[in-house]
């Protein structure tokens, strides 16, 4: 028998890389049965997410997954970095794992910084 | 060399709907992070964006003008059409056609093309 | 949308003058403004991007700074070839929008 629960459907350590200047959708896969739950993005800064209240959302529905979308308008530089989503269900925070946006300058985009690099040198992400 | 032209009428009834073209060369709509789009200046007035073509597919319009405006790539001839329905005398301007790299600066732009709108 | 505002919306300079014109956006743009120069009849050309990088190509008399909501363009010498009208657009967010222009003419 299918769980009724809420499931969010973001891969452990997903990543997207992408360009400053270019529109993008960051999708949330989102299953539930009956009532559509509220969900909301967040940003991680170091142990706390915070959460993106200004910025533009929608719902995008399929046959078997809804999917909740965080609307880039364009990318900018300083979105780099890791966002999760989180999705209120009768009284329950269920937490998406997060995925990560590598934000790149169109003239880097093909070096790639590794993880241990943006750490130590932020700077390489908008050269 | 990047260089891009308009082309199209220089004069349209109201009403009617304006097709102009852009025709570029020195890049490709299809590399990472290019994008052509549109911006107008009526004579003695201000700047205005109006629509742009990403490498993507992804386009975007100006929200005062969405339900008029169509752009169009045809990525094999190096062209981009701008299809503007309803004109009307205030959107009599100069339209030029501009080229992005990357953030969304124009560094390259066509020489222009004025419109009239009049009966 | 993001409206653009500058002043002032013309200026009287002498050659060797040093110019100053600002920018203010409605809402925090980060860094994510140009500045473009527009001579009568011709497309305008980009000199300064992300609110202080010169473009290649344009001389270095022409800078640029300041972030959030408030920006400035300054010509250290006003060259002849510099009167002009200054635009400044934002490129945090669709639509992208310019400012109203400053005129630079001979004083």
């Known amino acids: 028998k299918e769980s009724c629960d809420v499931q969010l459907y973001i891969k452990r350590q997903s990543e997207h890389s992408i360009l400053a200047g270019d529109p993008f959708e960051l999708e949330c896969p989102v299953k539930y049965c009956a009532n559509r739950p509220h969900v909301t993005w967040c940003k991680l800064n170091g142990t706390t997410c915070v959460k993106l209240e200004d910025r533009q959302t929608s719902w995008k529905e399929e046959k078997n997954i809804s999917f909740f979308i965080l609307h880039f308008e364009p990318v900018l530089p300083n979105d780099n970095g890791s966002y999760r989503c989180s999705a209120n269900f009768q009284s329950n925070l269920i937490e998406s794992h997060s995925t990560t946006l590598y934000v790149t300058d169109v003239k880097s985009a093909s070096e790639r910084p590794s993880k241990d690099e943006m750490a130590s040198r932020p700077w390489l992400l908008y050269r | 060399q990047i260089t891009l032209k308009e082309s199209g009428p220089t004069l349209v009834k109201p009403t009617q709907t304006l097709t102009l073209t852009c025709t570029f060369s020195?890049?490709?709509?299809?590399?990472?992070?290019?994008?052509v789009g549109w911006i107008r200046q009526p004579p003695g007035k201000a700047l205005e964006w109006l629509a742009q073509?990403?490498?993507?597919?992804?386009?975007r319009y100006s929200p005062s003008l969405k339900s008029r405006l169509t752009i169009t790539k045809d990525t094999s001839k190096n062209q981009v059409v701008l299809t503007m329905t309803n004109m009307d005398p205030v959107d009599t301007a100069t339209y030029y056609c501009t080229h992005k790299l990357g953030m969304n600066y124009f560094d390259y732009w066509g020489q222009g093309t004025l419109v009239t709108v009049s009966s | 949308d993001i409206q653009m505002t500058q002043s002032p919306s013309s200026v009287s300079a002498s050659v060797g003058d040093r110019v100053t014109i600002t920018c203010r956006a409605s809402q925090g743009i980060s860094s994510w403004l140009a500045w473009y120069q527009q001579k009568p009849g011709k497309a305008p050309k980009l000199l300064i991007y992300a609110a202080s990088g010169l473009q290649s190509g344009v001389p270095s008399r022409f800078s640029g700074s300041g972030s959030g909501t408030d920006f400035t363009l300054t010509i250290s010498s006003l060259q002849p070839e510099d009167f002009a009208t200054y635009y400044c657009?934002?490129?945090?967010?669709?639509?992208?929008?310019f400012g109203p222009g400053t005129k630079v003419d001979i004083k």
């Open positions: 020195g890049f490709s709509l299809s590399t990472s992070g290019v994008g």
């Open positions: 073509e990403f490498w993507t597919g992804d386009k």
């Open positions: 657009q934002q490129a945090n967010s669709f639509p992208f929008t």
